[in-house]
Amino acid sequence: VLEVYYTSLRCRCVQESSVFIPRRFIDRIQILPRGNGCPRKEIIVWKKNKSIVCVDPQAEWIQRMMEVLRKRSSSTLPVPVFKRKIP
């Protein structure tokens, strides 16, 4: 559900939304930390209806959701966090 990528690509998000998406309609979340060609952190959400949206990292709901997902992934519950190290 929650993925953290370190990438050398430029910014992926042209426009960001802060509109709430309940977790039940989210397929996965990709986090692109700032640096390596993009000056800001980006969050990309894949929805269950196959659409994709960039979410404002400052949106309160996404911060709450990521915290829940981090807690779940640090326990024995099946919500993996995948990380790619900087080459």
Partner: antibody, heavy 123, light 106 residues
């Protein structure tokens, strides 16, 4: 007081189409996602579709995907369900329900429901 | 898809009894479960969401507990108006209702 009133049900032949409506009042319609849930005679509840508060996102279970389309008109405080290629197993009471508050961040489920409209698919 | 197995499917009890209904999810749903009451010919009514949060106006004799995959709904002391069918709903991953529990007068 939150009120949801469904209409448009009736008898339709297999393969036919029907459009259900739901008139909402007593709350800020454009701030809430909305859903349709159905109940076959003597059976349990089954989720059919959900649409986001602005109408840009719709979600369906696999058994109705491609046949049913949920839509809304926020100016008219109305929710719709267009049902095509209807089958006998689509026979049910169809309820519209208020879903999550789109301007918030609470993971709330459907809270208020209408009284339902009966759809019968039979030849 | 997440399956919700609700038990029992029917239950006979008397006024004043303590009644417990269970729902088991096929995978972890955190605490994202709701409970509804439905009377014949009527729309479902939300009683509890997020496992244990009572809706405004719902009597305190209704309660819920659990997390992960196993959840319980309890009526501490049955009242005449509580005889109805009860459904659980998971809303962690799309929506799935349990099969329902019909609560009848013994």
């Amino acid at each position: 007081e939150v009120q949801l009133v469904e209409s448009g049900g009736g008898l339709v032949q297999p393969g036919g189409s029907l459009r259900l409506s739901c008139a909402a009042s007593g709350f800020t319609f454009s701030s809430y996602a909305m859903s349709w849930v159905r109940q076959a005679p003597g059976k349990g509840l089954e989720w059919v579709a959900t649409i986001s508060e602005g109408g840009s996102d719709a979600y369906y279970p696999d058994n109705v995907k491609g046949r049913f389309t949920i839509s809304r008109d926020n100016a008219k405080n109305s929710l719709y369900l267009q049902m095509n290629s209807l089958r006998a197993e689509d026979t049910a009471v169809y309820y519209c329900a208020r879903d999550y508050y789109g301007s918030g961040y609470e993971e709330s489920p459907m809270d208020y429901w209408g009284q339902g409209t009966l759809v019968t698919v039979s030849s | 898809d997440i399956q919700m197995t609700q038990s029992p499917s029917s239950l006979s009890a008397s006024v004043g009894d303590r009644v417990t209904i269970t729902c088991k999810a096929s995978q972890d749903i955190n605490k994202y479960i709701a409970w509804y009451q439905q009377k014949p010919g009527k729309a479902p009514k939300l009683l509890i969401h997020y496992t244990s949060t009572l809706q405004p106006g719902i009597p305190s004799r209704f309660s819920g507990s659990g997390s992960g995959t196993d959840f319980t709904f309890t009526i501490s002391s049955l009242q005449p108006e509580d005889f109805a069918t009860y459904y659980c709903l998971q809303y962690d991953n799309l929506y799935t209702f349990g099969g329902g529990t019909k609560l009848e007068i013994k």
